[in-house]
């Protein structure tokens, strides 16, 4: 730099007013936004900047200091006396660090020519800024025709009265951008053509979209593109313990802003989002799916002692169906229904009860009716089978009553009413049911179906049969009706308390038709189908124990 002897520089001591004002103004402006990466900031360089003034008596560095006596690199030129000024200030080489578009922020004071005394005639109010790309750190070239003009810089607020105002110096700030850059670095140059300028700060930076976590995806620092309208698509990577089914992307704008987010990451099962990270679910909490937002407290009757639980374990004697989501409470089989009552008539049995005291914790209680037919003599019961109809149904009954149609008459039934829910079949414990014992009323018996011929002679026929399938009560007697074939109107009735009879006084070699019915206290049943038997001829032998089909 030019010699400072005899010039108006601040001595490197004491709190110089102008310097303090500059410092205060600069300090407030010193912090760069997070999307700007400085390649050069003359305010932060402690030693020699290594800039060159050409000619030597043009730009001069003035020794401003801040309150800590750290130097501020301020370059001043005020060659307003002489015509045809052409003073150059050349920076050292500046690496562009891979950026293809850079920004130059100048802070300067530019004195209004009107504030200078009349008679100067050469005063200007602008200066020029140039750049020169180079891969060579030592290739500073002071031939001005090598440099490309960036712009002519004028003050937005050139202070006519050197306006320090309320002791706060107004610095003009101008920002220009340059691109696309193709080499490793560049030099800047400032050309004075006869202005009165103090160049207080030169900051060269590029813009980046700063590393950010958005929607649980990490997007890395991304240098903006060379084109001022360019959007760079950047893929994000999911933060720890997160997953995606829609890969996250964002677009980095030329201004260093993240735009147009696409896709997202979600905290995986067992983790929840907190402050942009996936935090483990605490014991007692779970998250079953990445699509859930937060860890939830274990549902009723379940627990987890682990971190990062994706489900909770059911307490002892509590269960969850496989089809149940992990968010559902664990339940246990309900207790038995209560206060079951029956009402019997000739054609049906009506049962009614109230719900169990303990539903097991769920709302899905239904009822199952098990019908057992019991032999009163032997005390042995067997399932009723298909002869009973249940109205409305036997299984999955939602209401607390059921009607059984077509029960057998004069039969001992045990109806077991069991309350069930979705986990009843998972429980190894005993069934919980209430029993109702019912004896149906007697009814006319069903027809006799199985008749066997016994001894047949020329004048008699002996028969035997089995009790009807459904006696529907106690068989008091059987009535046997028989007649000679085709002589139906002339029939004979025999009554018998046994299941065998012998019809006597029959004609030899004649066909007889037999029909049998049983009687209970409720009355006679219908006659059986017709059974035909033939007496033997006079000379024939007797025939016994042949079953008539």
């Amino acid at each position: 730099p030019a010699s400072l002897a005899g010039c108006y520089s601040a001595p490197l001591k004491g709190p110089l007013w102008t310097c303090l004002l500059l410092c205060a103004a600069l300090r407030t402006l010193l912090a760069s936004p997070s999307n700007e990466v400085n390649l050069l900031d003359s305010r932060t360089v402690l030693g020699d900047l290594g800039w060159i003034a050409f000619p030597k008596n043009g730009w001069e560095e003035i020794g401003e200091v801040d309150e800590n006596y750290a130097p501020i690199h301020t370059y001043q030129v005020c060659k307003v006396m002489e015509q045809n000024q052409n003073n150059w200030l050349l920076t050292s080489w500046i690496s562009n660090e891979g950026a293809s578009r850079i920004f130059i922020e100048l802070k300067f004071t530019l004195r209004d020519c009107n504030s200078l005394p009349g008679g100067l005639g050469t005063c200007k109010e602008t200066f020029n800024m140039y750049y020169f790309e180079s891969d060579d750190e030592n290739g500073r070239n002071i031939k001005d025709n090598q440099y490309i003009k960036i712009d002519t810089i004028a003050a937005d607020e050139s202070f006519t009265e050197l306006d320090l105002g309320d002791r706060v110096m107004k610095l003009n700030t101008e920002v220009r951008d340059v691109g696309p850059l193709s080499k490793k670095g560049f030099y800047l140059a400032f050309q004075d053509v006869g202005a009165c300028i103090a160049l207080v700060s030169v900051r060269v930076y590029y813009k980046k979209c700063p590393s950010v976590v958005r929607h649980l995806a990490v997007f890395p620092d991304t240098i903006t593109g060379a084109d001022s309208s360019q959007l760079l698509e950047v893929s994000g990577s999911c933060v720890n313990h997160s997953v995606t089914d829609d890969p996250p992307k964002m677009h980095c704008s030329a201004e260093g802003e993240w735009l147009v987010p696409i896709g997202k990451c979600m905290c995986k099962a067992g983790y929840e989002e907190k402050n942009g990270t996936c935090q483990v679910c605490r014991p007692g909490f779970f998250k079953a799916s990445p699509h859930s937002q937060t860890c939830s407290k274990c549902p009723p009757h379940s627990y987890t002692h682990e971190e990062a639980s994706t489900s909770c374990v059911c307490e002892k004697d509590y269960f969850r169906r496989e089809s149940d989501p992990p968010t559902m409470a664990c339940t246990r089989p309900p207790s038995a229904p209560r206060n079951a009552i029956s009402n019997v008539n000739e054609t049906s049995v009506f049962l009614e009860w109230i719900p169990p005291a303990d539903t097991g914790g769920g709302k899905d209680v239904s009822y199952y009716i098990l019908c057992k037919k019991c032999n009163s003599h032997a005390g042995v019961c067997e399932e009723c089978g298909g002869h009973v109809r249940y109205l409305p149904q036997q299984i999955g009954l939602k209401n607390t009553s059921v009607m059984m149609a077509d029960p057998l008459a004069h039969t001992n039934y045990t109806f077991e009413i069991e309350a069930v829910n979705g986990v009843s079949d998972l429980s190894p414990g005993t069934r919980q049911y209430v029993s109702v014992n019912v004896t149906t009323n007697q009814a006319a018996p069903s027809p006799v179906t199985n008749v066997k011929k016994g001894k047949i002679a020329k004048n008699s026929i002996s028969l035997s049969w089995q009790e009807p399938d459904r006696p529907n009560g106690i068989i008091l007697e059987y009535e046997i009706k028989y007649f000679e074939k085709d002589q139906e109107t002339s029939y004979t009735i025999i009554k018998s308390k046994e299941t065998t009879i012998t019809a006597e006084g029959l004609k030899p070699a004649s066909v007889y038709v037999f029909q049998i019915r049983a009687r209970t206290a409720a009355g006679y049943g219908v006659f059986s189908r017709r059974f035909e038997f033939e007496t033997t001829p006079v000379f024939g032998a007797s025939n016994d124990q042949s079953q008539i089909p």
Partner: antibody
């Protein structure tokens, strides 16, 4: 080092003329303006005006037009103050002072030792 | 023409004491003000320009402030060599001096 050298004292009669030289050294003469300041005996400083050493263009303060002329000889880095038709009230020490213009302000940073001009009959 | 009025005309202080000199302009001169020191038989010496900026080699016991019409020069601890006459001067299209303040030994 930078200095301005003025001539010794002058005694003149009323109506006469005087030409006070101010020789600069230690810097480029044409890069700084030159100002003239008058100080009457026992009085304060009075700015007379200045001359652009690059263009030769002078600027005069109120009350210093007509009889007062600023001039230059850049070949010898010298500025001149010429006063014609001298009057008794022109008796004073006349200082040349180099003017420095900066973005932060202006000032006369280097002064000559002064030339006493006495006008007496 | 802008008139500068300095006060007091004379200021008597003891060495080591603080001295405060005032300069008032008839109209705003913003910060276009300089201060000079003149000792008997010597040329003036530039102390401050731009209302508050030290010239080269000026001790930091001298400080100045103000803008617009009211300006102050302060000598924090007067040294024996500081006894002199102090002038303020405004600069713009036309320049003028104040009438001066004499700082003398008390």
């Amino acid at each position: 080092q930078v200095q301005l050298l003025q001539s010794g004292a002058e005694v003149k009669k009323p109506g006469a003329s005087v030409k006070v030289p101010c020789k600069a050294s230690g810097y480029t003469f044409t890069s700084r303006a030159m100002s003239w300041v008058r100080q009457a005996p026992g009085q304060g400083l009075e700015w007379m005006g200045w001359i652009n050493t690059n263009t030769g263009n002078p600027t005069y303060a109120q009350g210093f037009t007509g009889r007062f002329v600023f001039s230059l000889d850049t070949s010898v880095s010298t500025a001149y103050l010429q006063i014609s038709s001298l009057k008794a009230e022109d008796t004073a020490v006349y200082y040349c002072a180099r003017v420095r213009f900066t973005v932060y302000g202006d000032g006369m940073d280097v002064w000559g030792q002064g030339t006493l001009v006495t006008v007496s009959s | 023409e802008i008139v500068l009025t300095q006060s007091p005309a004379t200021l008597s202080v003891s060495p080591g004491e603080r001295a405060t000199l005032s300069c008032r302009a008839s109209q705003s001169v913003s910060s276009n003000l300089a201060w000079y020191q003149q000792k008997p038989g010597q040329a003036p010496r530039l102390l401050i320009y731009g209302a508050s900026t030290w010239a080269t080699g000026i001790p930091d016991r001298f400080s100045a402030s103000g803008s617009g019409t009211d300006f102050t020069l302060t000598i924090s601890r007067v040294e024996p060599e500081d006894f002199a006459v102090y002038y303020c001067q405004q600069y713009g299209p036309s320049w003028t001096f104040g009438q001066g303040t004499k700082v003398e030994i008390k």
